[in-house]
């Protein structure tokens, strides 16, 4: 007859490494008499005999985890007790090793140029995987804008057009490598006008083509507005190449108009818009067209505030749906263009433009605009702005003064009334009157009319030959 013997664990539990979905076994060999009862715990919680995820064999000495999950990680203990002496226990750890797995892969992203983009790449694995990124066919290099975050996500600050492309993340540890699917980063660019339409001064019944070129991502659409409304007549031709759209509007001109090119593209739920405006004016008005529709009112704008005669009434042309707005936008566009001209020319040109676009007005049954006096127009053209005028004259339509793609709506001096014929029929430019007070160096002008000073000019210009047409009495 055997003598009773307290349990002794002859093979203590060891740390077991196991891969996910593989089998892991703990051995707890016990010598004792009588045969002991063996129980198993994981993290001090009893493993039930009927738990189908486990197999307990060899009288409880063998614990097998049939398909390891990452949540099986922990401390496993076996306890043997046969009523003789005390119970004995041995413990060992299960370390679940895991090939890299991408739990939150990157997704396709559309982002506006200049914003921040984040492509996610969350991983699992043991040992912890390292994450790198591939753009196109080559490894992505980090720099001051581009960084791989601790989480594995890729962050790109101030996204540029060249960041667009296909990306994938790579998770790697000692057990293997995982690749995400390729995702696309699309960089959207706000609509921008590359070439604004140019203004034209044409005869009644002419054909004019206005051209507007815009760029953006996605490629913008271009629409045309005539005096605040959608263009009602005229044909539009469009051409798209790369990310550039070129739109040409052909018009048959029967009335003056303000034409606006609007380039629009969509970014998610939002739109970006760029605008450029041009005028089409009619050079020679026939008698019937001269009875122009318009009204006299106070000038409320900003651009010409310092130039126009204080508290005078000016003419607003109702061929525009909102004359005040249209004329102010025109003068604003023209004014910006004057930043490039000489200090001598600029104030004179500003005076000319403001008094041309906002002509002094005589209210009455038929409100009548008063054009600028020819002599003042010629003084600006051939004295103050002679150099600028000559430089531009060869490159432009008659009656238009352009610089680059922009325009200045300047009157044709020869068509204006002379102050000598009817001093009440035209407007003087106060700026020029003011300047002529200070003249000491300019030669006197001989004319059949009384001799008069010309607007002030530097001494170096005193050798100019000046025609009597300028004399301002």
């Amino acid at each position: 007859e055997k003598l009773p013997k307290a349990p002794v664990i002859t093979t203590p539990l060891e740390t077991v490494d196991a891969l996910v979905e593989e089998v892991a076994t703990f051995m707890c060999a016990v010598e004792s008499y009588p045969q002991p009862e063996i129980s198993w715990t994981r993290n001090k919680i009893l493993i039930k005999l009927f738990d189908t995820r486990y197999s307990i064999r060899e009288n409880g000495q063998l614990l097998t985890i049939l398909s390891v999950e990452d949540s099986d990680d922990g401390i496993y203990c076996c306890t043997a007790n046969n009523g003789v002496g005390g119970a004995v226990e041995s413990c060992g750890a299960l370390q679940v090793k895991m090939k890299p797995k991408i739990t939150r892969p990157p997704i396709n992203v559309k982002i506006i140029e200049g914003l921040k983009a984040v492509l996610p790449c969350t991983t699992m694995g043991n040992p912890k995987p390292s994450v790198s990124w591939i753009k196109g066919d080559s490894a992505l290099r980090e720099n001051s804008r581009i960084a791989v975050l601790e989480s594995g996500s890729l962050r790109i600050h101030n996204v540029q057009k060249e960041d667009a492309g296909q990306y994938r993340c790579v998770a790697k540890n000692s057990l293997g490598t995982a690749y995400s699917k390729l995702v696309k980063l699309e960089v959207e660019v706000f609509a921008r006008i590359l070439r604004a339409p140019e203004s034209h001064n044409v005869t009644f019944g002419s054909f004019v083509t206005l051209r507007c070129t815009a760029i953006g991502m996605p490629v913008p659409t271009i629409s045309w507005i005539e005096n605040g409304n959608a263009v009602s007549s005229g044909s539009i031709q469009e051409n798209v190449k790369d990310r550039v759209i070129d739109s040409r509007l052909q018009l048959f001109i029967t009335k003056p108009g303000l034409y606006t090119c609007i380039a629009t593209n969509k970014h998610g739920e939002k739109f970006s818009t760029a605008k450029a405006a041009a005028t089409v004016s009619i050079a020679e008005w026939s008698k019937s067209q001269k009875e122009s529709k318009g009204y006299c009112a106070q000038y409320r704008g900003e651009v010409c505030d310092a130039v126009l005669v204080k508290d005078s009434l000016v003419f607003f042309n109702t061929s525009y749906p909102d004359p005040e707005e249209a004329q102010e936008l025109l003068i604003h566009t023209a004014w910006n263009e004057l930043k490039a001209v000489s200090p001598l020319c600029r104030p004179a040109a500003e005076a000319l433009l403001c008094n041309h676009l906002f002509q002094e007005c005589s209210p009455g049954v038929l409100p009548t605009p008063m054009p600028i006096c020819r002599e003042y127009c010629l003084a600006v053209k051939e004295l103050f702005c002679a150099k600028e005028w000559l430089a531009m004259e060869g490159k432009t339509h008659r009656g238009l003064y352009r610089s680059g793609m922009h325009f200045l709506p300047v009157p044709e001096c020869s068509k204006l009334p002379s102050m000598h014929q009817d001093p009440t029929a035209c407007t003087r430019l106060p700026y020029l009157d003011y300047k002529k007070e200070n003249i000491t160096t300019f030669p006197s002008i001989t004319s059949s009319k009384p001799s008069v000073d010309i607007p002030n000019l530097p001494a170096s210009t005193s050798s100019f030959a000046v025609s009597p047409a300028y004399s301002m009495t």
């Epitope: 009112a297 106070q298 409320r300 900003e302 505030d305 909102d322 005040e324 707005e325």
Partner: antibody
Framework: EVQLLESGGGLVQPGGSLRLSCAAS????????MSWVRQAPGKGLEWVSA????????YYKESVKGRFTISRDNSKNTLYLQMNSLRAEDTAVYYC??????????????WGQGTLVTVSS | QTVVTQEPSFSVSPGGTVTLTCGLS?????????PDWYQQTPGQAPRTLIY???SRHSGVPDRFSGSILGNKAALTITGAQADDESDYYC????????????FGGGTKLTVL
């Protein structure tokens, strides 16, 4: 839909300062003149200041000249009113209002809900 | 200093017509003052009705119309309704010396 949302109002002591902001949405902010209009409790409307679309010029009611400064940040779609040397008579609801066009003095065609400024010791 | 004048109060019967006026303490109101009209109900922000003398703001019923009557700007409401009971303000562009915008004192309209 045009929306104007004023903020920055509150209680301030005489001589103190406040900066009101007006966040605009639903229209191309940079294409419109803007104004501040105030209304003292139980009183009528009083125009305070105006600024055109590009902010080049600024206009003020005589009694606030030198104390108030209107400005705009078209990139942020925001209008501001910096109010210094505040007086008891500046107590009012301050409305931000959109002008009908680019110029500073077009009609006021959209209004915010207002922010209350109380100047009291 | 020029003051913009309005009737302090006015009453009208439902369905009736009323004309509110806006004048200057010295001088006449002209279209160069670009008269604007605003409606305000208690506790609410103002609402634009008429701008530049006679242009109706979008969404404003055609019962409201603006004009120059003699030397004053006028707002006429035809077929008055109960919800027209409000304060009405005119606004004028003023341009002597420096640019300015001035509101009238307002007219309290009661629909009896």
């Amino acid at each position: 839909e045009v929306q104007l949302l004023e903020s920055g109002g509150g209680l301030v002591q005489p001589g103190g300062s406040l900066r009101l902001s007006c966040a605009a949405s639903g229209f191309t902010f940079s294409d419109y003149g803007m104004s501040w209009v105030r209304q003292a409790p139980g009183k009528g409307l009083e125009w305070v200041s105006a600024i055109p679309w590009q902010g080049g010029s600024t206009y003020y009611k005589e009694s606030v000249k030198g104390r108030f400064t209107i400005s705009r940040d078209n990139s942020k779609n925001t209008l501001y009113l910096q109010m210094n040397s505040l007086r008891a008579e500046d107590t009012a609801v301050y409305y931000c209002a959109k002008r009908s066009g680019r110029i500073a003095f077009g009609a006021l065609d959209a209004w915010g809900q207002g922010t209350l400024v109380t100047v009291s010791s | 200093q020029t003051v913009v004048t309005q009737e302090p109060s006015f009453s009208v019967s439902p369905g009736g017509t009323v004309t509110l006026t806006c004048g200057l303490s010295s001088g006449s109101v002209t279209s160069s003052n670009y008269p604007d009209w605003y409606q305000q109900t208690p506790g609410q922000a103002p609402r634009t009705l008429i701008y530049s003398t006679d242009s109706r703001h979008s969404g404003v019923p055609d019962r409201f119309s603006g004009s120059i009557l003699g030397n004053k700007a006028a707002l006429t409401i035809t077929g008055a309704q109960a919800d027209d009971e409000s304060d009405y303000y005119c606004g004028l562009y003023m341009y002597s010396g420096s640019k300015n915008y001035v509101f009238g004192g307002g007219t309290k309209l009661t629909v009896l």
